[in-house]
């Protein structure tokens, strides 16, 4: 099972498996009980903003990156925090939004060819060890992809959300990516509490929808810290 | 065209190296998981190591771990099996195959790993 | 690791007779995005395994109609409407909804 190939490759630190897979939002627990871990609710919309915190950029979304919220302020506290778009200033690229790089500290388009080869080197030397960032979720990747001209719908395989037809995400499924829903109100989402508890996401859920947020569900409050079911609840 | 191609097979001596390669072509290859497959002469077919979309996750099979490593190039198209230490019982032909997350997709023709003295 | 069991292991059939194989897997293969993750090839002699059938029931493309794949859960069937000359081989049953994948013994289909 894939848990005894987790551990026969000697992974750390991973969550016990939960008690549902995280596949499809909404949908019924997965029958097979060898991949059960949780999935991804990092990709929050502006609208929704929650604060992440974090330590590196590859620990927030596709459209974020890591940082002290206030200009000079605690370097130790650090958070997940809007990409930037074109035109706005940068100190690196992970800064810029998806389909930018940062340019003598201003976020410019890379579709410019000269700048592949160099976003290539970026993943080609991450590719070196073979227990890295688990997640995996780093933009790096997806900057030199080509643009698609028609939106992936639900089951497609994409590159970042915007590949993704409105009110889909693009979140990891199996060791692929694949348009999903987003979530609807009441449906289960998945809320990292703190560093270092992406675990291994196999199946990733999207995020909220617009208006909503990734709670503890009400009639949860008394359960114990890892059973506590988080759904999407209107602000 | 949607394709895979994989080469670098050949005949070895026990405890010698070989690297595979698969070409990818006609899909966005970045966005899949891959996998190698293999099989012994006149046997079954059997899983050996899958490579997540990006390169961050890698797992094995028991009978290769630590002595295979799977990779992959998204700037080339190209997924990588780098064998170490080879024994007899790794001789097979090896195919790579596309992660089943949307359509399927049928694998290459295979190249042919033969480990002998 | 999900042990994949088929049966029979051989299968000797009258060209224009109907063949059926069953395969039987350890764990259930449905997924929770409503998928079924079970495949179905065909290798002929001398040459590589070519996907007959995915996720359970769809022919992939310029697959003949005569074959059809059926099941649910853990119990799932390949069938031959009328053998051809043509479908000699052998037949494995896939699943790959947990690594490793693993695949069926394989069920070695010969013409009378």
């Known amino acids: 099972t894939l848990n005894s190939v987790l551990n026969s490759n000697a992974i750390k630190n991973l969550p016990p498996p939960l008690g549902g897979a995280a596949g499809h939002p909404g949908s019924a627990v997965s029958a097979a009980p060898g991949i059960l871990y949780p999935g991804g609710n990092k990709y929050q919309t502006i609208d929704n903003y929650q604060p992440y915190p974090c330590a590196e950029d590859e620990e927030c979304g596709t459209d974020e990156y890591c940082a002290s919220p206030t200009r000079g302020g605690d370097a130790g506290v650090q958070i997940c925090l809007a990409c930037r778009k074109r035109r706005k200033r940068c100190m690196r690229h992970a800064m810029c939004c998806p389909g930018n790089y940062c340019k003598n500290g201003i976020c410019v388009s890379s579709d410019q060819n000269h700048f592949r080869g160099e976003i290539e080197e970026t993943i080609t030397e991450s590719f070196g060890n073979d227990h890295s960032t688990l997640d995996g979720y780093s933009r790096r990747t997806t900057l030199s992809s080509k643009m698609y001209h028609t939106k992936g719908q639900e089951g497609s395989v994409c590159l970042r959300s915007s590949d993704c037809a409105s009110g889909l995400c693009c979140a990891r499924h199996f060791w692929s990516k694949i348009c999903k829903p987003v979530l609807k109100e009441g449906q289960v989402c998945t809320k990292h509490r703190r560093k270092g508890s992406h675990g291994l996401e196999i199946f990733q859920r999207c995020y909220c929808g617009e208006g909503l947020s990734c709670r503890i569900q009400k009639d949860h409050h008394q359960a114990s810290n890892s059973s506590r079911l988080h759904t999407c609840q209107r602000h | 065209q949607v394709q895979l191609v994989e080469s670098g097979g050949g005949v070895v001596q026990p405890g010698r190296s070989l690297r595979l390669s698969c070409a990818a072509s006609?899909?966005?290859?970045?966005?899949?998981?891959m996998h190698w497959v293999r099989q012994a002469p006149g046997k079954g077919l059997g899983w050996v190591a899958v490579?997540?979309?990006?390169?961050?996750?890698?797992y094995y099979a028991d009978s290769v771990k630590g002595r295979f490593t799977i990779s992959r190039d998204n700037s080339k198209n190209t997924l990588y099996l780098q064998m170490n230490s080879l024994r007899a019982e790794d001789t097979a032909v090896y195919y790579c195959?596309?992660?089943?997350?949307?359509?399927?997709?049928?694998w290459g023709q295979g190249t042919t790993v033969t480990v002998s003295s | 690791d999900i042990v994949m069991t088929q049966s029979p292991l051989s299968l000797s059939v009258t060209p224009g007779q109907p063949a059926s194989i069953s395969c039987k897997s350890s764990?259930?293969?449905?997924?929770?995005?409503?998928?079924?993750?079970l495949y179905w090839y065909l290798q002929k002699p001398g040459q590589p395994p070519q996907l007959l059938i995915y996720e359970v029931s769809n022919r992939f493309s310029g697959v003949p109609d005569r074959f059809s794949g059926s099941g649910s859960g853990t119990d799932f069937t390949l069938k031959i409407s009328r053998v051809e000359a043509e479908d000699v081989g052998v037949y494995y049953c896939?699943?790959?909804?947990?690594?490793?994948?693993?695949f069926g013994q394989g069920t070695k289909v010969e013409i009378k």
């Open positions: 490579i997540s979309y990006d390169g961050s996750d890698k």
């Open positions: 195959a596309r992660d089943l997350v949307d359509t399927a997709m049928p």
């Open positions: 896939m699943q790959s909804i947990q690594v490793p994948w693993t």
């Open positions: 764990q259930s293969l449905l997924h929770s995005d409503g998928k079924t993750y």
């Open positions: 006609g899909f966005t290859f970045s966005s899949y998981g």
